[in-house]
């Protein structure tokens, strides 16, 4: 689809005559008829196959034709066509005299023709005007012409329809040849595919507008190249979506179980050594002078009761100090200035002079101890009960309450599970810490040797001196068949031969 445009520029008819040579009265009121048709080597009359157009009266005799696009497109003249431009044409331009106002062909006398020109040739589509001038004996016509494509038609012959658009069926403008030219940020055959943010992952990301990167399910990050771990994954990562691969020191489905509490939380204080002992558990080994689960407590050196003879202990920055009672001295109040005359022994202790009366010693009654018999004996301090027995103070003595399976003063005796001879068929009983075990004789099995098993009595090779052994399956016993010169149930005795 396109338009053949003809621009009339100047018509000269100085004598004001018709083609017949007769003059126009009072002058030649001139209008034009244009016929555009297919190419003919010799332009002949006939249908104007590409179209016709007429002008109003443009002037008298000789005149220049003004450009007049505003007034209905009078000049240049427009000859639209709705087909592919063939590249060739024939053009007939007739100048006519209009005696009256009716310009219809049937209203004009045949001799009203002033001049007729016919041209033919090739014409390519383009913006440039071709200038031409045709001269006859009495007239001259100057004009120019061109073929341009209609709006939205492109290409060498105006055959390619292309409409610029900017919606989801395309984001493009049209090139002169009718091909699409994508707007920035768009690609694809119809410029319908946005160019995603540079680096946006091809599989895991997409976009609905340029420079965007939207992530498919399971992916995240600016470029959709980071997988999303399992929901609730605490200390783990993924290489594909919904995984939860635990970081070092973490375990469990969600990597939320702390297997390295020591490193992650540093719970031990005061330079203690931390040891992981399972999920979320640990043990602190304290440095000397500290105690507590996390070694958070500084040990008082007075806690070990270093002051003797009733001395009172005072903690100091660099240790401790004993405040001794009257009659005692020394770092731990271990030296006495008292003698037996001062009755230093408490709780009925008897005093004995030593070193010619310079010192003394107390002999304490039962249940009391200490250099002055000042301490009541806790008979359980030495934890004398074995095998987890519980020590109970009972006045002057103590007793051990034993755990099941143990007996004796100190729970030192294991109650024998073998006392009631539980092993059948001569099985040997062995006491264990929590139960017993039977060692069964040949031919028997089971926890208590209660199951008889069929045995090969010859398996132990009971026959001597190359005797042949036979098993009696009914009694699970063997019989030895002795070689010549031997007797006995096992052929163990040689006989004197004559």
């Amino acid at each position: 689809s396109g338009v053949f445009q003809l621009q009339l520029q100047e018509f000269i008819n100085e004598r004001g005559v018709l083609a017949s040579g007769r003059p126009c009265e009072p002058g030649c009121r001139t209008f034009f008829r244009v016929c555009l048709k297919h190419f003919q080597a010799v332009v002949s009359p006939g249908p104007c196959t590409f179209g016709t157009v007429s002008t109003p009266v443009l002037g008298t005799n000789s005149f220049a034709v003004r450009d007049d696009s505003s007034g209905g497109g009078r000049n240049p003249l427009q000859l639209p066509f709705n087909f592919t431009w063939p590249g060739t044409f024939s053009l007939i331009i007739e100048a006519w005299h209009a005696p009256g106002d009716d310009l219809r062909p049937e209203a004009l006398p045949p001799d009203a023709l002033i001049s007729k020109i016919a041209i033919q040739g090739s014409l390519a589509v383009g913006q440039n005007w071709l200038l031409d001038e045709q001269t006859s004996t009495l007239t001259r016509l100057r004009y120019s012409y061109r073929v341009i494509c209609s709006d939205n038609y492109y290409g060498d012959n105006c055959s390619r329809l292309c409409k610029k658009r900017n919606d989801h069926f395309g984001h493009y403008v049209c090139q002169p040849d009718g091909n699409l030219s994508c707007l920035p940020g768009w690609t694809g055959e119809y410029c319908q595919q946005p160019i995603c943010l540079s680096g946006c992952h091809e599989q895991n990301g997409y976009c609905s507008k340029p420079a965007e990167c939207l992530c498919r399910p399971g992916w995240q990050g600016r470029l959709c190249n980071e997988c999303i771990p399992h929901n609730g994954c605490r200390h783990g990562t993924c290489s594909t979506p919904w995984q939860c691969t635990c970081d070092e020191g973490w375990g469990g489905l969600f990597c939320d179980q702390d297997l390295n509490y020591c490193t992650h939380h540093s719970p031990c204080k005061n330079g203690a050594t931390c040891s992981n002992s399972g999920q979320r558990s640990y043990t602190c080994t304290c440095r000397p002078g500290y105690t507590g689960v996390d070694c958070e407590l500084e040990l008082s050196e007075c806690d070990s009761n270093p002051c003797r003879n009733g001395g009172s202990c005072k903690d100091q920055e660099d240790g401790y100090h004993c405040l001794c009672p009257p009659g005692y001295y020394g770092l731990h109040c271990e030296h006495s200035t008292l003698s037996c005359a001062d009755s230093p022994c408490f709780n009925g202790g008897s005093c004995r002079e030593r070193n010619q009366g310079a010192n003394y010693a107390c002999e304490c009654p039962p249940n009391f101890t200490g250099s002055n018999c000042e301490k009541k004996v806790d008979r359980c301090t030495s934890n004398p009960c074995a095998n987890g027995g519980q020590c109970l103070n009972r006045g002057p003595s103590r007793m051990c309450r034993c755990r099941p399976g143990f007996t004796g003063t100190y729970c030192e005796l294991h109650v024998s599970d073998c006392a009631r001879n539980p092993c059948a068929h001569g099985g040997t009983c062995h006491d264990l810490e929590n139960g017993l075990m039977c060692t069964c004789p040949a031919g028997f099995s089971g926890r208590r040797c209660e199951v008889r098993t069929s045995i090969d009595a010859c398996a132990s090779s009971p026959c001597f001196n190359r005797a042949t052994c036979y098993t009696d399956l009914s009694t699970d016993t063997f019989v030895c068949n002795c070689p010549y010169g031997f007797v006995g149930s096992r052929c163990e005795f040689p006989v004197g031969l004559p």
Partner: antibody, heavy 121, light 107 residues
């Protein structure tokens, strides 16, 4: 031969929601050459474009219906859907699905048989 | 909102006549127009796309044009099977717009 097979007629109560389906057979819904659209036709009325979807999930809606509908696509089953919410009697219509071809300037060259939705108390 | 106006609402023809449907919209010639035929109780069918192109299977008696503010659909010689409603359609940005339709009936 590409065909669009729509789900059956629905009778719904006002205020309810409904989801209609359109299964594509004889071709892939994941083709980059098509959008997949929904068109509404009330009894005795003309056609009204509702919206469309690309295989990537990008959607476009008629502004006047945007709050009413959601269009989704399931490439694994070669099916696309329209969900209508807060139904009123105004939503009673035949709903057509269609294939909109980029090569045809957005013209709909294939249509489903239509699903009749009736909203009635 | 972009509006497509179809006229007339009803066209009465006799078989064999030439008929033209009109569809107008602001600068419609700068958009691609499509035309759909919908027979009674049937689904719409594309008969013209990109102003004047016919999909395969559409008879050559159907033709289209689009320039300025008007698109036209012509049926060169109407046959009884052409009796249907005809809708024009165009895209305004990202929204599809249909005309109200023209009913083609037999005289």
């Amino acid at each position: 031969q590409v065909q669009l097979q729509q789900s059956g007629a629905e009778l719904m109560k006002p205020g309810a929601s409904v989801k209609l389906s359109c299964k594509v057979t004889g071709g892939s819904i994941s083709s980059s050459s098509y959008y997949w659209g929904w068109i509404k036709q009330r009894p005795g009325h003309g056609l009204e474009w509702i919206g469309d979807i690309y295989y990537t999930g990008s959607t476009y809606y008629n502004p006047s219906l945007k709050s009413k509908v959601t269009i989704t696509v399931d490439t694994s089953s070669n099916t696309f859907y329209i969900q209508l919410i807060s139904l009123t009697t105004e939503d009673s219509a035949i709903y057509y699905c269609a294939r909109q071809a980029l090569a045809m300037g957005g013209g709909s060259d294939k249509w489903g048989q239509g699903t009749l939705l009736t909203v009635s108390a | 909102d972009y509006l497509l106006t179809q006229s007339p609402a009803i066209l009465s023809v006799s078989p064999g006549e030439r008929v033209s449907f009109s569809c107008s919209g602001q600068r419609l010639g700068d958009k691609y127009a499509s035309w759909y035929q919908q027979r009674t109780n049937g689904s719409p069918r594309l008969v013209i796309y990109e102003d004047s192109k016919r999909p395969s299977g559409i008879p050559s008696r159907f033709s289209g044009g689009n320039s300025g503010d008007d698109a036209t659909l012509s049926i060169n010689s109407v046959e009884s099977e052409d009796i249907a409603d005809y809708y024009c359609q165009a895209w305004d940005r990202d929204t599809g717009v249909f005309g109200a339709g023209t009913k083609l009936e037999l005289k």
